[in-house]
């Protein structure tokens, strides 16, 4: 009886089990009742990542540095390409087709997460007893200066975007 | 249905070299190979070679390596074996085969080498 | 390459007889796939070959079940249980398992 269902990593085709084609290599010719299936490498800049009965290999995705991107892992016969971006800039998506520039923490804002290949800048609000009074990318909010450490009271209070003022206290008149 | 026309009979010339055809009708014809087998007068069967009409891939028997040339032309669904330098040794029946849900062969040609 | 040996040569049978043709290959059979390229088919006078059972065993769409093939690695047979004037001819056997692919010399198949 001719089969209905194969084993993994065959296919069904004119009633017989055909082996499929390991990752990295594409299908020529499926196998008949006197052959094997024959399967061949893919190309320099192609891939095929699964177990297959693929004609054609997929082509190397290309890092267009035009769009900012650059290779951070060399495609293989079985992998494709992964692309990321230059110094200063993430993917606008997961796939990583383009490049965006990383944003600035405004002052009164600090970095919570430094911004990476593939995510932006994450910001958070300087909370009481921090500021931040640059517009950065790097720069966490800082704490405030503590006067006492240093024998001066505050003169001035700070805010999330000013740090406090320190002075000397006032003598004591007898 | 599938069917695997050849001509009846070739006659040529020693030395001379020789185009056998085999039309492939009723399948897609780059989905399959088309294999060539030789049979001499009351001899046994011998084969030749095989080519993959989707990329013009071939696989040999050695010993007919320098002696034929397989071809396809896709837009009329024909496969071609050219003998080359022949001899009274290559007179026999050309059979053009295909596999495959199913074996088909075709009627087979007459090669016949005589000055 | 690979040798295929048929015996025998010729085989006189009467109408309604078992006949039995053997075949054996100078090297086994068995491709690394776990599939056994032998294959068996007839040929009758001025025809072209025509296949009977694939890879030891399997018959063809629309051969009789009177015709069954067994064996494994060298040493194969076809049996042929009731035998009818329409099966006479040569039978020939042949691999494709290693390349090049080889085929029997043929046993002949005749009325006693």
């Known amino acids: 009886e001719p089969p209905t269902a194969c084993r993994e990593k065959q296919y069904l085709i004119n009633s017989q089990c055909c082996s499929l084609c390991q990752p990295g290599q594409k299908l020529v010719s499926d196998c008949t009742e006197f052959t094997e299936t024959e399967c061949l490498p893919c190309g320099e800049s192609e891939f095929l990542d699964t177990w297959n009965r693929e004609t054609h290999c997929h082509q190397h995705k290309y890092c267009d540095p035009n769009l900012g991107l650059r290779v951070q892992q060399k495609g293989t016969s079985e992998t494709d390409t992964i692309c990321t971006c230059e110094e200063g800039w993430h993917c606008t998506s997961e796939a990583c087709e383009s490049c965006v520039l990383h944003r600035s923490c405004s002052p009164g804002f600090g970095v919570k997460q430094i911004a990476t290949g593939v995510s932006d800048t994450i910001c958070e609000p300087c909370p009481v007893g921090f500021f931040s009074n640059v517009s950065s990318a790097f720069e966490k909010c800082h704490p405030w200066t503590s006067c006492e450490t240093k024998d001066l009271v505050v003169q001035q209070a700070g805010t999330n975007k000013t740090d406090v003022v320190c002075g000397p206290q006032d003598r004591l008149r007898a | 249905q599938v069917q695997l026309q050849q001509p009846g009979a070739e006659l040529v010339k020693p030395g001379a070299s020789v185009k056998l055809s085999c039309k492939a009708s009723g399948y897609t014809f780059i989905s399959y190979y088309i294999y060539w087998v030789k049979q001499r007068p009351g001899q046994g069967l011998e084969w030749i070679g095989g080519i993959n009409p989707r990329n013009g891939g071939t696989n040999f028997n050695e010993k007919f390596k320098s002696k034929a040339t397989l071809t396809v032309d896709k837009s009329s669904s024909t496969a071609y074996m050219q003998l080359s330098s022949l001899t009274s040794e290559d007179s026999a029946v050309y059979y053009c085969t295909r596999h495959g849900n199913g074996v088909y062969w075709g009627q087979g040609t007459t090669l016949t080498v005589s000055s | 390459d690979v040798v295929m040996t048929q015996t025998p040569l010729s085989l006189p049978v009467s109408l309604g007889d078992q006949a039995s043709i053997s075949c054996r290959s100078s090297?086994?059979?068995?491709?690394?796939?776990?599939?056994?390229?032998l294959h068996w088919y007839l040929q009758k006078p001025g025809q072209s070959p025509n296949h009977l059972i694939y890879q030891v065993s399997n018959r063809f769409s629309g051969v009789p079940d009177r015709f069954s093939g067994s064996g494994s690695g060298t040493d194969f047979t076809l049996k042929i249980s009731r035998v009818e004037a329409e099966d006479l001819g040569v039978y020939f056997c042949?691999?494709?398992?290693?390349?090049?692919?080889?085929f029997g010399g043929g046993t002949k198949l005749e009325i006693k």
């Open positions: 042949s691999q494709t398992t290693h390349v090049p692919w080889t």
């Open positions: 090297q086994s059979l068995l491709h690394s796939n776990g599939n056994t390229y």
